[in-house]
């Protein structure tokens, strides 16, 4: 897995977008797509060091 951001602070939460929870906003096509199509940080296996958990809002960034 890739290294993720060091910390995910509350003020980084994105403004609302029209994406449903299972989708992420694709900045390049300016549309919501399945999150699996984008290289977004993914949870690591238990026991592995990982960044702070993503909030429910983050996939819509």
């Amino acid at each position: 897995m890739r290294r993720g951001p060091r910390s995910l602070r509350g003020r980084d939460a994105p403004a609302p977008t029209p994406c449903v929870p299972a989708e992420c906003f694709d900045l390049l096509v300016r549309a919501c797509v399945a999150c699996g199509l984008l290289r977004t940080p993914r949870p690591k296996p238990a026991g592995a060091s990982s960044p702070a958990p993503r909030t429910a809002l983050q996939p819509q960034e």
Epitope: R2, R3, P5, D12, P14, A15, T17, C24, F25, D26, L27, L28, G36, L37, L38, R39, T40, P41, Q58, P59, E61
Partner: antibody
């Protein structure tokens, strides 16, 4: 960890075609955006273009119709072709992966220096 | 395309000094979603660029806290509070707000005075 490695000739003659391969391990090129970026002598970085998860491409208009980016998903590789090169295309060429949450280039190849000279 | 203007081009410093690099964009980098996609990279000699700061002020994993980013709109700054030998190299700002194309600053070479 995701790793990228560029390969291809280090010397190309003027008017010929520059062809490079980026081999990706640790991630699938059917997810995300895969990019080519070059650095000229003197430190200028130029974004060249991408191929996306769907196979769609974007090319920087500065490269006009000289550029082509393709992929082979079975090999997990993507490719750069630059036609009709001149000495102005002498640069270090990097392939890079794009983070899809914060939109930065999170993983880069080591880069390959391509010299255009007769 | 968005033009990223970086100053200075060369920054001679003494080890332990503070260093400051400025980056100015030709348009505001605030995206319609409220985020500002301004990032900083460091390219050490013989290496590829590596991400230091993402979205103006967030340090990437493993980046020492002597690095800090600030700014808004069109004006951004990268500060190194106490320069160490391992910090030497070329620093680039980059924007991902108005894309494609992604654009980069002209680079600032941090070197020993």
């Amino acid at each position: 960890d995701v790793q990228l490695q560029e390969s291809g000739p280090s010397l190309v003659k003027p008017s010929q075609t520059l062809s490079l391969t980026c081999s990706v391990t640790g991630d699938s090129i059917t997810s995300g955006y895969w990019n080519w970026i070059r650095k000229f002598p003197g430190n200028k970085l130029e974004y060249m273009g991408y191929i996306s998860y769907s196979g769609s491409t974007y090319y920087n208009p500065s490269l006009k119709s000289r550029i082509s980016i393709t992929r082979d998903t079975s090999k997990n590789q993507f490719y750069l072709q630059l036609l009709s090169v001149t000495t102005e295309d002498t640069a270090t060429y990097y392939c890079a992966g794009l983070d899809g949450l914060y939109w930065y280039f999170d993983v880069w190849g080591a880069g390959t220096l391509v010299t255009v000279s007769s | 395309d968005i033009v990223m203007t970086q100053t200075p081009l060369s920054l001679p410093v003494s080890l332990g000094d503070q260093a400051s690099i400025s980056c100015r964009s030709s348009q505001s980098l605030v995206h319609s979603n409220g985020n500002t996609y301004l990032h900083w990279y460091l390219q050490k000699p013989g290496q590829s660029p590596k991400l230091l700061i993402y979205k103006v002020s967030n340090r990437f994993s493993g980046v020492p806290d002597r690095f800090s980013g600030s700014g808004s709109g069109t004006d951004f700054t990268l500060k190194i509070s106490r320069v160490e030998a391992e910090d030497l190299g070329v620093y680039f700002c980059s924007q991902s707000t108005h894309v494609p194309p992604f654009t980069f600053g002209s680079g600032t070479k941090l070197e020993i005075k």
